[in-house]
Interface confidence: low
């Protein structure tokens, strides 16, 4: 039961991470205009994302503009877009693989195969989490670097947007979920002889493995 619980928790966290990644990548809140310094001349807030930028006027009116040409976009933005899309697809694949090998599904009967499938799913989700982290950390690094760079016009200094924080949380959830799925896979054991008197099959991953629960912690 313990490993089933871990599986469910891992998958739940991964689903939340996937949703967080989706929202983070879609929202135009990666960079927010920083109202600091003394060269801000426009009474508005600028939100920038991977796909569009939005201007919120002091009146509350918001106008969003999708970036025109893919070729005219900075390479780091194109890379961030690509990594986000790949991470989302990879996380989705990881979840599908996890469901296939989950204890509570009958897609695969063989316990050993199930364990390997869940381990694979965990690794995929860990990788997806890392892929989310890369553009989020890169963007944050660029913002912080510009923020303290005296050469950057004060008017163009940005603050870390909500999408970055959400991205960090989503990456953490994906990696935590993936890590938990990896942990549900038991260490290889020496197969015990099946005594005719005992009448039980080879211990499965569902908790009766002969290992104390504390060994999983």
């Amino acid at each position: 039961m313990a490993s089933t619980g871990l599986e469910l928790l891992g998958m739940t966290l991964a689903v939340l991470g996937w949703l967080g990644t989706l929202v983070s990548c879609a929202l135009p809140l990666w960079k927010v205009t920083a109202f600091i310094g003394n060269s801000i001349v426009v009474a508005q807030v600028v939100w920038e994302g991977l796909w569009m930028s939005c201007v919120v006027q002091s009146t509350g009116q918001m106008q969003c503009k999708v970036y025109d040409s893919l070729l005219a976009l900075p390479q780091d933005l194109q890379a961030a877009r690509a990594l986000c899309v790949i991470a989302l697809l990879l996380a989705l694949l990881g979840l599908l693989v996890a469901i296939t090998g989950a204890q509570c599904t009958t897609c695969v009967e063989d316990e050993g195969a199930k364990a390997r499938i869940v381990l694979t799913a965990g690794v995929i989700l860990l990788l997806a989490g890392i892929l989310v982290l890369i553009p989020v950390c890169w963007t944050a690094h660029a913002i912080i670097q510009d923020f303290y760079n005296p050469l950057v016009a004060e008017a163009l200094k940005r603050e870390l947007g909500a999408s970055l924080y959400l991205g960090w949380a989503a990456a953490a959830l994906l990696m935590l979920g993936g890590g938990l799925l990896c942990c549900t896979c038991p260490p290889p054991q020496v197969e015990r002889p099946r005594g005719p008197r005992l009448g039980y099959s080879i211990p499965s991953r569902s908790g009766a493995s002969g290992l104390d629960k504390r060994d999983y912690v």
């Epitope: 801000i40 001349v41 503009k65 040409s69 005219a72 950057v152 016009a153 008017a155 163009l156």
Partner: antibody, heavy 120, light 108 residues
Framework: EVQLVESGGGLVQPGGSLKLSCAAS????????MSWVRQTADRGLELVAS????????YYPDSMKGRFTISRDNAKNTLYLQLSSLQPEDTALYYC?????????????WGQGTSLTVSS | QIVLTQSPAIMSASLGERVTMTCTAS???????LHWYQQKPGSSPKLWIY???TLASGVPARFSGSGSGTSYSLTISSMEAEDAATYYC?????????FGGGTKLEIK
């Protein structure tokens, strides 16, 4: 219709002072950032100073700091540029420009300019 | 400071001809911080293209802008008499904001 009309230019001796004005109409002046930009035949266009909508923040490129002061009177819909310790190289056509309605600090509207000549 | 170099400084084109002028920055500029202005003799500059490729209000569709990093360009698909003017690029990516030296476009 947005209109910006500069005034106050003229002939000034080196070391002298002058105050340029820019009267704005056709838009809500108090909601928009403004700039002064100057133009000469040899140096082209140069940003002189910027000010935010309420006058609380100003910006001067390093080359302009100290001798120029930008200010505004939102009640009178007027932008000002105080020039002091004028030098012959300050001879230029001075424009006021408005950051009206787009995102990235482009100057949407410009006045017709006022000419300043610094000469003895 | 970022130096914007426009080329050619002067160019002439026949009516109906395709025209391209370039603006090269001394270091990388965000495409969202690069703008173009048009100025005719005796008049003040007018915002023509902002954020690299967005045409300002009233600008004919024959104009277009593109570029990224250090290289930007303004293109007129079919030159018309009213397009004869000087075009300036402008960046507000790094302090101080700077303008290019201009490209004067004449009718051949």
């Amino acid at each position: 219709e947005v209109q910006l009309v500069e005034s106050g230019g003229g002939l000034v001796q080196p070391g002298g002072s002058l105050k340029l004005s820019c009267a704005a109409s056709g838009f809500t002046f108090s909601s928009h950032g403004m700039s002064w930009v100057r133009q000469t035949a040899d140096r082209g266009l140069e940003l002189v100073a910027s000010i935010n909508s309420n006058g609380g923040r100003t910006y001067y490129p390093d080359s302009m700091k100290g001798r120029f002061t930008i200010s505004r009177d939102n009640a009178k819909n007027t932008l000002y540029l105080q020039l002091s310790s004028l030098q012959p190289e300050d001879t230029a056509l001075y424009y006021c420009a408005c950051y009206y309605d787009n995102t990235y600090y482009a100057m949407d509207y410009w006045g017709q300019g006022t000419s300043l000549t610094v000469s003895s | 400071q970022i130096v914007l170099t426009q080329s050619p400084a002067i160019m002439s084109a026949s009516l109906g001809e395709r025209v391209t002028m370039t603006c090269t920055a001394s270091s990388s500029v965000s495409s969202s911080s690069l703008h173009w202005y048009q100025q005719k003799p005796g008049s003040s500059p007018k915002l023509w293209i902002y954020t690299t490729s967005t045409l300002a209000s009233g600008v004919p569709a024959r104009f277009s802008g593109s570029g990224s990093g250090t290289s930007y360009s303004l293109t007129i698909s079919s030159m018309e008499a009213e397009d004869a003017a000087t075009y300036y690029c402008h960046q507000y990516h790094r302090s101080p904001p700077t303008f290019g030296g201009g490209t004067k476009l004449e009718i051949k």
